[in-house]
């Protein structure tokens, strides 16, 4: 807290300019009018104030706007945003995407702070949904943003927003998140032709059910092993050897290198060894010839 002292003669600030960096904290408090500061916030960012000086400027704005800053001030906060607490940000009503971009720019290249997380949360809640433009902006600044959302939060993403998602935005998503995103992607890309559709849907396939994988196997898609390894185990298990061969195309040879890893390992255990041998890859661990496979879960369902 800066104590109230009279402004020395001739030091009253008539505008926000670089001469103010030479003011002591008490001089800033005494000589800078809060209303002037609010109208010239766009200048603050261009002036190399110390963080101590920024604290004083923040204090002045807090006194002027105890209920929270107006968006006209928020948009021009610049480095003063680094002085805001999540509690301060919760008082704001940010509706403009330009404001959001301006504030994210301040923290660009750094991890998402609690302040940024609060800002994004306020913005998205205010909009009611995560629209395409917002998602575009957020993933540009934070590629991992989408995967930081809970499945419940992801459910508010409209299918139209999926067009903004890049493959790297899904790198850290877990299966539960992909389960929510995949149906939206399927809907978003449904009018595309086969090869174009596969290019777009590929990153989301970790949420695809068996029937969709079977359908893809009929389309000569040549799925790479990296994508195959990210598929849901429960979706891969029912696929036949022929379907996996069609799904992977020339990449089928990569199964050998992954035979000890899920989902390949579990899939091998479900296939007849005879069928696996037809691939000529030396895959071992299938069901020996002559053995009968009883699906006990099916038997229980019938009784």
């Amino acid at each position: 807290e800066v104590e109230k002292t009279a402004c020395p003669s001739g030091k009253k600030a008539r505008e926000i300019d670089e001469s103010l960096i030479f003011y002591k904290k008490w001089e800033l408090e005494a000589c800078v009018d809060a209303a002037l500061l609010a109208t010239q916030m766009d200048r603050v960012n261009a002036i190399p104030f110390t963080y101590e000086q920024l604290d004083v400027l923040k204090h002045k704005l807090d006194e002027l706007y105890p209920q929270g800053y107006p968006e006209s001030v928020i948009q021009h906060l610049g480095y003063l945003f680094l002085k805001m607490s999540p509690e301060d940000i919760r008082k704001w009503n940010v509706t403009s995407l330009e404001t959001l971009k301006a504030l994210l720019e301040v923290n660009k290249g750094h991890e998402m702070s609690p302040q940024v997380a609060t800002l994004i949360d306020r913005f998205v809640k205010g909009r009611g949904q995560l629209d395409k433009d917002t998602l575009d902006t957020l993933t540009a600044f934070y590629p991992g943003y989408l995967c930081s959302l809970s499945p419940e939060e992801l459910s508010s993403v409209p299918p139209s927003s999926i067009w903004a998602v890049r493959p790297q935005d899904l790198d850290t998503c877990d299966p539960r998140q992909l389960d929510v995103l995949y149906p939206k992607a399927r809907l978003a890309f449904q009018n595309m032709n086969g090869s174009e559709y596969f290019v777009k849907i590929q990153s989301f396939l970790g949420g695809a059910p068996t029937e969709d994988l079977k359908a893809l196997s009929q389309q000569n898609v040549s799925m790479d092993l990296a994508t195959f390894m990210k598929l849901r185990t429960d979706a891969v298990l029912p696929l036949t050897v022929a379907e996996v061969q069609k799904l992977l195309g020339p990449h089928v040879e990569g199964l050998k290198a992954e035979e000890r890893h899920r989902p390949v390992r579990d899939w091998i255990l479900r296939q007849r060894q005879d069928d696996l041998d037809t691939l000529g890859l030396g895959l071992q661990g299938g069901i020996p010839n002559g053995y009968l496979v009883l699906d006990l879960s099916m038997q229980e369902a019938l009784s």
Partner: nanobody, 119 residues
Framework: QVQLVESGGGLVQAGGSLRLSCAAS????????MRWYRQAPGKQRELVAT????????YLGSVKGRFTISRTNAKNTLLYLQMNSLKPEDSALYIC????????????WGQGTQVTVSS
């Protein structure tokens, strides 16, 4: 964390020149603005010059035209203060300062280097 070490101070006659250096180490990629402050015995610390992250320089009125601040953004960030036409009233402990990006935004200080200008 950023460490700052000043050098180049000393005793000089009025009208003479000195060049102060400040070597930064540690998280130098996060440095935003760099500054030279000075503190004379019994007086408050005052800002002498600032060089912003975009290279713009700002000077205290009484040193304008005599002092030049500069920085290099090489592997070892260095801050300089070229002081010409020195006056006895420039005598003080000159302290290097740097601040960093991000939350909460920290200020770092060197120990200072003494400049004494004799008449």
């Amino acid at each position: 964390q950023v460490q700052l070490v000043e050098s180049g101070g000393g005793l000089v006659q009025a009208g003479g020149s000195l060049r102060l250096s400040c070597a930064a180490s540690g998280s130098i990629s996060s440095i935003r603005h760099m500054r030279w402050y000075r503190q004379a015995p019994g007086k408050q610390r005052e800002l002498v010059a600032t060089v912003s992250n975009d290279g713009s320089a700002y000077y205290l009125g009484s040193v304008k035209g005599r002092f030049t601040i500069s920085r290099t953004n090489a592997k070892n960030t260095l801050l300089y203060l070229q002081m010409n036409s020195l006056k006895p009233e420039d005598s003080a402990l000159y302290i290097c300062n740097a601040d960093t990006w991000g939350w909460p935004g920290a200020d770092y200080w060197g120990q200072g280097t003494q400049v004494t200008v004799s008449s």
